[in-house]
Interface confidence: low
């Protein structure tokens, strides 16, 4: 018996071939011997089966001795043994129809779970293997679960259903709703304007929700809400903003925040949350601000950084075009009695400069100049 696998909602063509290459009488029946369709001369005739409005054949092939049964908009319950009667012979074809659906919306928040459910005919014992867009393979039976969805899981999931050594492939488009970056860090000199950007890693026609930026300054004992905003059809409107600092927010996507000045008291970490309409849970992006200050007080030249730096980072003070005078894995370094000239304060990671601040040290009778 020939086995054919079909996909729910698709069209399947079951073949039936006569030895004579001409139009002769044929009938297609189901396992209950109920006639589905056949011919009377060159006319297609249909029986009383439940497939009546979804069954068809290809008249153009009859003259070649081919009498296919075409079933449109397949349903799981169409799974059956179909019998083609032609030339006093019977050809049996077993059709097995499968469906694969995502248990929830195909737009899921990062960190949520995806469950794929296989609909299969009674008596079948299929195996399923799905491949995520990043090449991860997941195997299962009637259900497949993927917990903790990541941004790279966005895209087309290809699932292969295997039954009787035959396979059928399903493609499901999954969109993981997330920010492009889980975390970002901004390095700024004291006084500079700070730009925070929160690009989304997906595009949808209409985007509505609300968001908030909570900030934990390094110098503060508790975190505070810096800004709250609404998102309506990709338009951003500020609801509430602190007076210090007074953030400005762009009116369009991507979400964009401007801090007029980087100051030591603002250095720290923030968490931007975005709650989307009709979605449970929130999107998160962490943002970090590191602020550098170089100062000269009497005979002491000091370089300091505030904010979430790691011990891997090197803080240095050097006279321009010379070797570093001091270089430490610390948040503050200083030089006593610095010689006159342009001094550089550098924050670097494995030799790569992340932040630089210059200060001009004048001969001892004058005051320092900060360029």
């Amino acid at each position: 018996k020939k086995v054919v696998l079909g996909k729910k909602g698709d069209t399947v063509e079951l073949t039936c071939t006569a030895s004579q290459k001409k139009s002769i009488q044929f009938h297609w029946k189901n396992s209950n011997q109920i006639k589905i369709l056949g011919n009377q001369g060159s006319f297609l005739t249909k029986g009383p089966s439940k497939l009546n409005d979804r069954a068809d054949s290809r008249r153009s092939l009859w003259d070649q001795g081919n009498f296919p049964l075409i079933i449109k908009n397949l349903k799981i319950e169409d799974s059956d043994t179909y019998i083609c009667e032609v030339e006093d012979q019977k050809e049996e074809v077993q059709l097995l129809v499968f469906g694969l659906t995502a248990n929830s919306d195909t737009h899921l928040l990062q960190g949520q779970s995806l469950t794929l459910t296989l609909e299969s005919p009674p008596g079948s014992s299929p195996s399923v293997q799905c491949r995520s867009p990043r090449g991860k393979n997941i195997q299962g039976g009637k259900t497949l679960s993927v917990s903790q969805l990541e941004l790279q899981d966005s895209g087309t999931w290809t699932c292969t259903v295997l039954q009787n050594q035959k396979k059928v492939e399903f493609k499901i488009d999954i969109v993981v709703l997330a920010f492009q970056k889980a975390s970002s860090i901004v390095y700024k000199k004291e006084g500079e304007q700070v730009e925070f950007s929160f690009p989304l890693a997906f595009t949808v026609e209409k985007l509505t929700g609300s968001g908030e930026l909570w900030w934990q300054a390094e110098r503060a004992s508790s975190s505070k809400s810096w800004i709250t905003f609404d998102l309506k059809n990709k338009e951003v409107s500020v609801k509430r903003v602190t007076q210090d600092p007074k953030l400005q927010m762009g009116k369009k996507l991507p979400l964009h925040l401007t801090l007029p000045q980087a100051l030591p008291q603002y250095a720290g970490s923030g968490n931007l949350t975005l709650a989307l309409e009709a979605k449970t849970g929130k999107l998160h992006q962490e943002v970090n601000l590191v602020v550098m200050r170089a100062t000269q007080l009497q005979k002491n030249l000091t370089c300091e950084v505030w904010g979430p730096t790691s011990p891997k980072l090197m803080l240095s003070l050097k006279l321009e075009n010379k070797e570093a005078k001091v270089s430490k894995r610390e948040k503050a370094v200083w030089v006593l009695n610095p010689e006159a000239g342009m001094w550089q304060c550098l924050l670097s990671d494995s030799g790569q400069v992340l932040l630089e601040s210059n200060i001009k040290v004048l001969p001892t009778w004058s005051t320092p100049v900060q360029p």
Epitope: P133, R134, G135, L151, Q152, S154, G155, V175, Q180, K181, S184, S197, P199, A201, F202, T203
Partner: antibody, heavy 124, light 107 residues
Framework: EVQLVESGGGLVKPGGSLRLSCAAS????????MNWVRQAPGKGLEWVSF????????YYADSVKGRFTISRDNAKNSLYLQMNSLRAEDTAVYYC?????????????????WGQGTMVTVSS | DIQMTQSPSSLSASVGDRVTITCQAS??????LNWYQQKPGKAPKLLIY???NLETGVPSRFSGSGSGTDFTFTISSLQPEDIATYYC?????????FGQGTKLEIK
């Protein structure tokens, strides 16, 4: 038509500098991670540097670390490679290459679009 | 760094032949492997990504398989236009690394 066009190659003395540019067209440049890959005459391919779509992540091969700087200007649809302290062993055809992806994000690692390459010769 | 060892380094075959190139990674790279074709004087071209996926527009005579440390690239029926150097490349870890290449010639 999706394409990448490199420029800026040429003959330079050891210790010298060059700045390579790569102009992108036909796709949303700001959505894709980009790379520089080089090929010394008669030799194989060597990955040089990577930059993510919004420049958050930058990586270099050990052989160029501290001497080369990758950057991009998404407003100008351009990728750059600043090469300082050049050595004879940096002589190669330099290709800019796009990482496979789409407007939602990138799929790490496969270079689906390449430029025609620009020749850099370091010789005294 | 992950080393990629390709073999053979050169190969001579006739039109219509089945051609196989292998690539071995110095550590498990799952299926994070791509195959490229480079014709003389031209830029490389992506043929296979994720070890076995055929890039859009690439003829079906090209295929790839393997996982972990051992990978295979196959041309089912060699055509004259397939004369080129073929490279494997891993992207399990930065730095991305390429195999040394396999130069394919027609007998």
């Amino acid at each position: 038509e999706v394409q990448l066009v490199e420029s800026g190659g040429g003959l330079v003395k050891p210790g010298g500098s060059l700045r390579l540019s790569c102009a992108a067209s036909g796709f949303t440049f700001s959505s894709y991670s980009m790379n520089w890959v080089r090929q010394a005459p008669g030799k194989g391919l060597e990955w040089v540097s990577f930059i993510s779509s919004s420049s958050s992540y930058i990586y270099y091969a050990d052989s160029v670390k501290g001497r080369f700087t990758i950057s991009r200007d998404n407003a100008k649809n351009s990728l750059y490679l600043q090469m300082n302290s050049l050595r004879a062993e940096d002589t190669a055809v330099y290709y800019c290459a796009r990482e496979r992806g789409d407007d939602y994000g990138d799929y790490e690692g496969a270079f689906d679009i390449w430029g025609q390459g620009t020749m850099v010769t370091v010789s005294s | 760094d992950i080393q990629m060892t390709q073999s053979p380094s050169s190969l001579s075959a006739s039109v219509g032949d089945r051609v196989t190139i292998t690539c071995q990674a110095s550590q498990d790279i799952s299926n994070y492997l791509n195959w490229y074709q480079q014709k003389p004087g031209k830029a490389p071209k992506l043929l296979i990504y994720d070890a076995s996926n055929l890039e859009t527009g690439v003829p079906s005579r090209f295929s790839g398989s393997g996982s972990g440390t051992d990978f295979t690239f196959t041309i089912s029926s060699l055509q004259p236009e397939d004369i080129a150097t073929y490279y494997c490349q891993q992207y399990d870890n930065l730095p991305y690394t390429f195999g040394q290449g396999t130069k394919l010639e027609i007998k």
